[in-house]
């Protein structure tokens, strides 16, 4: 019951962390003005992976994509590369997840199988999770690095009289909802990976079965057992024994009350 | 097409107060903050500050905070602009602004103060 | 508060001459988010609303004739007429778009000569 519901639990934390991961590379808001030295300005500005966008005194807010590829800095295309990595990795995750789920019945799935692809979808949970955490880590470092570069140079004009203030861009609520949306994906992989190891068939100690055959009394113990860990062999596991002895039930999987579809 | 009518001319004695509306048609009300700029007889045009329709948050010039309230009502698509504590330097014109680049001005509603 | 002075406050000109006002702001209007320059120029005539003409500087509003034309960026800004009108007789104010307070400026009253 405790490995159904941290298979659960896992899938629901990452189904929210890869949501929370679309979410961030979808939103404008990566980088928003720094409103430290202007917190009275008419015009605010804010950029995201894909766009930048101006709200005005109107209330008004105009966007405009970035329609060059080339033009663009190295790092926000591998912010960009990270984040869809890090989707397209969750994504696939995900569907394998669901397969693996503890709860729902997929034909004679066997446990092994199931084992198999929840740690299949937990590794994947993790990555996708290091691939937005790193996303978002690479693009506060590059608003940190310009937010000190620009205040260097913040101030121009002559005589020291102030002119023109650069717009410095601080951290915006994208990458908040980056850093733990990753870390939920990472979570719930970690929590995939320890599921997987509670689904995976254990050696099981069967008891002595004596039964009385012809003349003589044979005591048979359970030496012959095939163990399957899950993460190799996928053969059904048998006990080998000889003649018509009795023998202990199989590992038995315990359905849900609920399918999660 | 989009436009702004205001509210008629007012005569108030000084320390009353006056409310007056600025009903906006032709356009999604919630679209643009409504801006609320005054003239007094021979000087420059004085904004005021704005409300945002969608969530009611205003922005007041330092000079009018405790002098005007500005509040809507979505639903008629209408802004208001209450002016307390009236003294003869607030006769002027009072208009309503919206739209993007503050191109739609509302026709101005004239406060007279005198006792 | 940006203060913005427009000089000169009161010009004289006949029909078909070519004007030119200026509006300088205490700091700069340019807002390197889309690259524009926020000053927004209003014409008024007595007793009306005033009414756009300019605004990001040098982009005319639909409806305004081309005989009108802005220029400038960051602190220094011009309104030119090529070719005035007898309608264009009016004041005109420069404003700041770019920081709250929004302000104006102390207007150009365009005379007939």
């Known amino acids: 019951m405790a490995v159904t519901a941290c298979q659960g639990l896992g899938f629901v934390v990452s189904l929210i962390g890869i949501a929370g991961i679309i979410a961030a590379t979808c939103m404008d808001q990566w980088s928003t003005q720094d409103l430290y030295n202007n917190p009275v300005t008419a015009v605010f500005n804010y950029q995201g992976l894909w766009r930048s966008c101006v709200r005005e005194s109107s209330g008004f807010t105009e966007c405009r994509g970035y329609f060059t590829l080339l033009g663009l800095p190295a790092m926000l295309q591998a912010v960009r590369a990270l984040m869809i990595v890090g989707i397209v990795l969750g994504a696939i995750g995900l569907l394998v997840s669901i397969f693996a789920l503890k709860c729902i019945r997929i034909g004679s799935m066997e446990d092994s199988a199931k084992a198999n692809m929840t740690l299949t979808s937990g590794i994947m949970f993790i990555v996708s999770g290091l691939c937005a955490i790193a996303g978002v880590s690479v693009f506060a470092n590059m608003l940190v690095t310009n937010f000190w570069m620009s205040t260097a140079n913040m101030y121009t004009g002559m005589g020291g009289m102030v002119q023109t203030v650069q717009t410095r861009y601080t951290f915006g609520a994208a990458l908040f909802v980056g850093w733990v949306a990753g870390g939920l994906t990472l979570i719930g992989g970690v929590m995939m990976c320890i599921a997987c190891r509670g689904l995976a068939p254990e050696e099981t100690n069967y008891k002595a079965v004596s039964y009385h055959a012809s003349g003589h009394s044979v005591a048979y113990k359970p030496g012959g057992f095939k163990a399957s860990t899950g993460f190799g062999s996928n053969t059904k596991n048998k006990k080998i024994y000889d003649g018509g002895a009795r023998t202990e039930d199989e590992v038995q999987s315990y359905p849900s009350k609920h399918d999660y579809v | 097409q989009v436009q702004l009518v205001q509210s008629g001319a007012e005569v108030k004695k000084p320390g009353a107060s006056v409310k007056m509306s600025c009903k906006a048609s032709?356009?999604?009300?919630?679209?643009?903050?409504m801006h609320w700029v005054r003239q007094a007889p021979g000087q420059r045009l004085e904004w005021i500050g704005y409300i945002n329709p969608n969530n009611g948050g205003t922005s007041y010039n330092q000079k009018f905070k405790g002098k005007a309230t500005l509040t809507v009502d979505t639903s008629a698509s209408t802004a208001y602009m209450e002016l307390s504590s009236l003294r003869s330097e607030d006769t002027a014109v009072y208009y309503c602004v919206t739209t993007r680049y503050l191109a739609v001005w509302g026709q101005g509603t004239t406060v007279t103060v005198s006792s | 508060d940006i203060q913005m002075t427009q000089s000169p406050s009161s010009l004289s000109a006949s029909v078909g001459d070519r004007v030119t006002m200026t509006c300088k702001s205490s700091q700069s209007l340019f807002n390197s988010g889309n690259q524009k320059n926020y000053l927004t120029w209003y014409q008024q005539k007595p007793g009306k609303a005033p009414k756009l003409l300019i605004y990001w500087a040098s982009t005319r509003e639909s409806g305004v004739p081309s005989r009108f034309s802005g220029s400038g960026s960051g602190t220094d800004f011009t309104l030119t007429i090529s070719s005035l009108q007898p309608e264009d007789f009016a004041t005109y104010y420069c404003q700041n778009d770019y920081s709250y307070p929004l302000t104006f400026g102390g207007g150009t009253k365009l005379e007939i000569k």
């Open positions: 032709g356009y999604t009300f919630t679209d643009y903050n």
